[in-house]
Structures are given as structure tokens and as C-alpha cells.
Amino acid sequence: QRFAQAQQQLPLESLGWDVAELQLNHTGPQQDPRLYWQGGPALGRSFLHGPELDKGQLRIHRDGIYMVHIQVTLAICSSTTASRHHPTTLAVGICSPASRSISLLRLSFHQGCTIASQRLTPLARGDTLCTNLTGTLLPSRNTDETFFGVQWVRP
Amino acid sequence: QRFAQAQQQLPLESLGWDVAELQLNHTGPQQDPRLYWQGGPALGRSFLHGPELDKGQLRIHRDGIYMVHIQVTLAICSSTTASRHHPTTLAVGICSPASRSISLLRLSFHQGCTIASQRLTPLARGDTLCTNLTGTLLPSRNTDETFFGVQWVRP
Amino acid sequence: QRFAQAQQQLPLESLGWDVAELQLNHTGPQQDPRLYWQGGPALGRSFLHGPELDKGQLRIHRDGIYMVHIQVTLAICSSTTASRHHPTTLAVGICSPASRSISLLRLSFHQGCTIASQRLTPLARGDTLCTNLTGTLLPSRNTDETFFGVQWVRP
């Protein structure tokens, strides 16, 4: 009983439940392969509880192990289109601070039009995650086709 | 020590750990694109702890942010088969109440025979999730090839 | 306040937050389809908190429902290569104890070069998970392309 009451009084943040789910805002300018994300209840079903957006890139606020997941669907795409525009690749990584830069997750589309994956990875406060899409096909902005999120799992 | 004791005395449900993993029961009749799911220890490794099944569709019992995941494999399928049939698409969405109807996750098979993805999304008590499979290829009922689940992540 | 202090004093293990993320070490000898995994901070971003490795296979230390996830990318692969070497299949299952042997997750590559999926499944202390790759194409050892992990979700 005491625990239940205490739990209700504590802010969720103290439990470390940082979580975010983002939708695609736009692609970068010509030489910038990054996808730019947005989130918040006004936009639909995307949200940020803990992490923040910094110029469309996701910045982590709490150290810990995170589940990172992503799905990207190419717009106006068929298996023929995809194979003719090969290679299209998506990479998720820590892009800043530069000292921690690393690729966490990488997938190629080959003859498919959607990639989806997830992984566990340690992230630190201040890490900014970037999602780089290389290739000549545009990603879909439909919120059920392209999304990116993180979930804090444990310290 | 006191916390550990209190935690042990509390039912898991009060911690909000709602979770379900379902296996395919059957497809719908001709005009019904929905997949019908089943779960429970008697069926193998599927289970429902919190959410319930309502005529083969998953109904949420606790408000919160959920990780929704799905894998669907088409039966007797090859890349040739997949390309020779009408585009097969899977969509996961809230189908009731009607006021909250929305597509959460959508994937096309293109020349592949399996789709798998996951996302974080807010769900409310009473939301029913439907998984719509459009196309003319049957989904596999093998429990390691086709499954659908949700995991409560935070309030 | 009391709750927060108690929580900090408890070892994480008592909360049941077992988690592991592994990277590919090597493939098995000729008649052994298993992938052999490795993990630990010295290797990069892989880790084991609770589960252990037993001759390259992941052994569970705590009963519960786990989220199991995997991504495997085939090395030096294109959709042409993949279709010419078909079928290449990945299966994740409990391989010991023999009495609990079962396939949990199965995917074929078809014309793709990467598979990625995840599922919830009950696992018991002592369960060893094996990942069997059948086919004639080598998996990539790049840590952002091939990885395997589990996350304890609830009892």
C-alpha cells in the first residue's frame, strides 16, 4: 500500500522511463543525408518524454541502455523502383558529441521499400542520434510508414 | 528492504506490466481483411497478461505508451510468388472505438514474404487493435513465423 | 522520498532488469548452423547484464517474459546474390535443455540481404538460445549490421 502511494507521488522521470517516438518532418538539404524528425501530441501520436529534439535530431537526457527502433518506407516505391535506385541505405548512429560518433544500426533496402529494425544500445546524456538516408528515393512522411523512437530500458 | 517486501506483496498488475503475445488463429471471411488472433499457455508460447481478446482482436485494458510489434510471414511464398500476386500489405491500427480509429503501422511485402516491425504508441483502455492483411496470399499460422504483441512501457 | 532511497539501495538485479546485446563472433564449423556470439564493453557496444554466454550461445539466468530481437545482414550480398543462394533462413530458438527445444522466431531472406525481427516469449533460467543460419552466404560481422539481444520484460 505504502509503495503504491509512493509510486504515485514520485514523478515518472525519477523512474527513468525516458521514451520518444518521432515522425518524419523533412529530409536535409542536398549534401545532408540526415532525416529531420518532429514529435509532440499536436502532431498526432508522436511524443517526447525525456529526450529532446535539437534541430530535428534526437538528444538523449538520461544515461542508460535504450531500445532504439526505426521504420522507414520509401515513397512512390515498388520493388522495381527500389532495385533501379539501389543502393538506398539507412544508418542510425550517434553523431554528437564527435568523440562518441558511431553507427548503431544499418540497413539497405535492396529490392524492398521498407526497412524496420531495433536494437539495444548504451546511450549517455547529451548523445545525439542521427538517421542518415543515402540514395535517391524520398522517404514517406506517412506517420504509420516512417517513424523513429527510443525507450530507456535500464541504467 | 522495505521496498523489496512491498514490491513482492503488490500484484504485478499494479505495476502496469500489461503484455500480450498472440499467434494467428484464422483469417477473416471474404470481405474482412482482419487477422484473427489467439493466445494462452494451452496454445504454446502465446499469452495475455492484462489485455484481452475480443472476437480475435486485441483489446487494451490499461492506458499508457505501448510497444506494438508484429511479424507476418506469407505461406507457401517465394519472391516470385509475392511479385505475381496483388500487392500484399499489412496495417496495424486502432479499429475501435471508431472515434480513435487510426493506422499505427503499415508495411508492404513487395518481393518479400515476411514483414516485421515495431513501434511505440499511446493506447487507452478500451482501444481495440486490428491487423488488416490485404492481398491474396495466405499468412502462415506457424507460431515462429506469424505473431503479434504489445508491451506496456510507461503511463 | 523513502521509495526513491529504497530503489537506489536495491541492486538492479533484484528488479529483474536482465538484458544483453551481442555481436557476431563467428559462424560454426561445417555441419553446425549456429551463429556464435560475443559481448562485453571491451568489444564495443555489446553487453551482458544477467544472461551469460556459454560457448557463444546465450543462456538465460532469470525466469520471465523477454523481448528477443535480432538483425542479421548477409555479407557481400545483393538481391541477385540472395536470390541465387536461396534459401537462406535464420531461426532463433531454445536449443537447451532439449526438453524445452523450440523455434521462437524464423525468417527467410528471399531476395533481401537483411532480416530483422523481435518477439515476446517466456524464457526460464537455464534456457539457452541458439540462432541457426542455414544457407551458403556468410553473415556480416559489422556490429551495426548483425546483432542479437534479449530484454527481460516481466515475471
Partner: antibody, heavy 119, light 111 residues
Framework: EVQMVQSGAEVKKPGASVKVSCKAS????????IHWVRQAPGQGLEWMGD????????SYNQKFRDRVTMTRDTSTSTVYMELSSLRSEDTAVYYC????????????WGQGTLVTVSS | DIVMSQSPDSLAVSLGERATINCRAS??????????MHWYQQKPGQPPKLLIY???NLESGVPDRFSGSGSGTNFTLTISSLQAEDVAVYYC?????????FGGGTKVEIK
């Protein structure tokens, strides 16, 4: 209501070709594969092949591979089955058929077209 | 190719009695949680009519006196209480792989 209406009976000489049509209505033509099945007089049923009207891809029974061609015209929702180098044993009723939800079994059939091969 | 063998070739049953037709595949037609076996009824001068799909599913509009069972290589079509309008030839068909093949047919008559 799904309907499959086939062209009329044909009489052909050995070595000639025949082209049978099947006009589909009552559903989205490009969605469902259309199969061809034949039945010789007093005999059983034999699957010849199928075509996906969405892109025109066809798959043929190896037995007929060198002699059969299946095509479609999406503007008229019609599929065609052409069989060449006809011989007397090709005398049969030729049916087109499609399915109601999933491919593999045939819920809707044409009325059949009798092709007689005789010198 | 998978060879489908039907038995018997013909069957005479009294009105109201049970009729049973068997179909054997040369190798298993069951996979992915389904048995890819289907049954048709054909009357003279008509195209076949789907009765049962995936071994045991009754097609919409088909009387429930028709039922199907079996898995792997052995399948059965049962007419629980034969009616006059059930006089016809019955065919089994598999769709496990290409080419699809049919059984040779069983002629059902009234005794």
C-alpha cells in the same frame, strides 16, 4: 456479383492455335489471379496455369509451357489463353476460374469453352 | 508433381445415408499451419463448384451436410445425409505447390 464469361465454342484443325477469352466482372480485375483449367470429355480436371492481371505475369504448368500463352487486357477486364500446335488430345472444355479471398482454390468459374480439334 | 489419388471411382449410397470419399496425395500438402486440399462438386454440363477449402472449411452457401477432414497426405470428404441433388462427380485438388493437380474424380449415385 462476380462473373466470368467465356468466348464461344471453337473447332480447330491439328497444328492450329486457339485463343479463348474470359471477361471478368463484379470485382477489381487487377486484384485476383485468373487460372485456366481444362477437362477432356469424360475425364478429370487439369490445371494449365494462371496470370496475374496486375502486371501480366503468368505461370504455366510445365506440360503446356511450350504451347500456352496467357495474356490480359486491363481495359476490358479480359484474360486470354492461347494454345498452339493443337492436337486431338487437346479437345476439351477450357475453364477460367478465380478465387474469393486467397489464391489456391477456385470459387468462381467461367461457363467453359469447348475446343474441338479435328481434321 | 504431386499426384492425387481418389477412391472409390464411384459410389452408390441410399438417400439419407452417409457418403465418404477419400483423397490421397503422393506427398504431404500440409504446411504453414494449413492443409492445402480443396473439394469440388461437378454436375453434367456445369463447371465445378467449390465445396470445401483448406481441408475443412465450408464454402459460403454450401449445405453443412458436407464436411472435410484430414491432414498431410490423407483427406476425406463426407456427405452426412445424401440428398438427390448431391448426385455428381466430386474432385479433390491441392494447392501446396505448382502445378496444382486434381484427383481423378468420384462419381456419387443414389442406390
Amino acid at each position: 456479383e462476380v462473373q466470368m464469361v467465356q468466348s464461344g465454342a471453337e473447332v480447330k484443325k491439328p497444328g492450329a492455335s486457339v485463343k479463348v477469352s474470359c471477361k471478368a466482372s463484379g470485382y477489381t480485375f487487377t486484384t485476383y489471379n485468373i487460372h485456366w483449367v481444362r477437362q477432356a470429355p469424360g475425364q478429370g480436371l487439369e490445371w494449365m496455369g494462371d496470370i496475374y492481371p496486375g502486371n501480366g505475369d503468368a505461370s504455366y504448368n510445365q506440360k503446356f509451357r511450350d504451347r500456352v500463352t496467357m495474356t490480359r487486357d486491363t481495359s476490358t477486364s479480359t484474360v486470354y489463353m492461347e494454345l498452339s500446335s493443337l492436337r486431338s488430345e487437346d479437345t476439351a472444355v477450357y475453364y477460367c476460374a478465380t478465387f474469393s479471398r486467397f489464391d489456391g482454390w477456385f470459387a468462381y468459374w467461367g461457363q467453359g469453352t469447348l475446343v474441338t480439334v479435328s481434321s | 508433381d504431386i499426384v492425387m489419388s481418389q477412391s472409390p471411382d464411384s459410389l452408390a449410397v441410399s438417400l439419407g445415408e452417409r457418403a465418404t470419399i477419400n483423397c490421397r496425395a503422393s506427398r504431404s500438402v500440409s504446411t504453414s499451419g494449413y492443409s492445402y486440399m480443396h473439394w469440388y462438386q461437378q454436375k453434367p454440363g456445369q463447371p465445378p463448384k467449390l465445396l470445401i477449402y483448406l481441408a475443412s472449411n465450408l464454402e459460403s452457401g454450401v449445405p453443412d451436410r458436407f464436411s472435410g477432414s484430414g491432414s498431410g497426405t490423407n483427406f476425406t470428404l463426407t456427405i452426412s445425409s445424401l440428398q438427390a441433388e448431391d448426385v455428381a462427380v466430386y474432385y479433390c485438388q491441392h494447392s501446396r505447390e505448382l502445378p496444382y493437380t486434381f484427383g481423378g474424380g468420384t462419381k456419387v449415385e443414389i442406390k
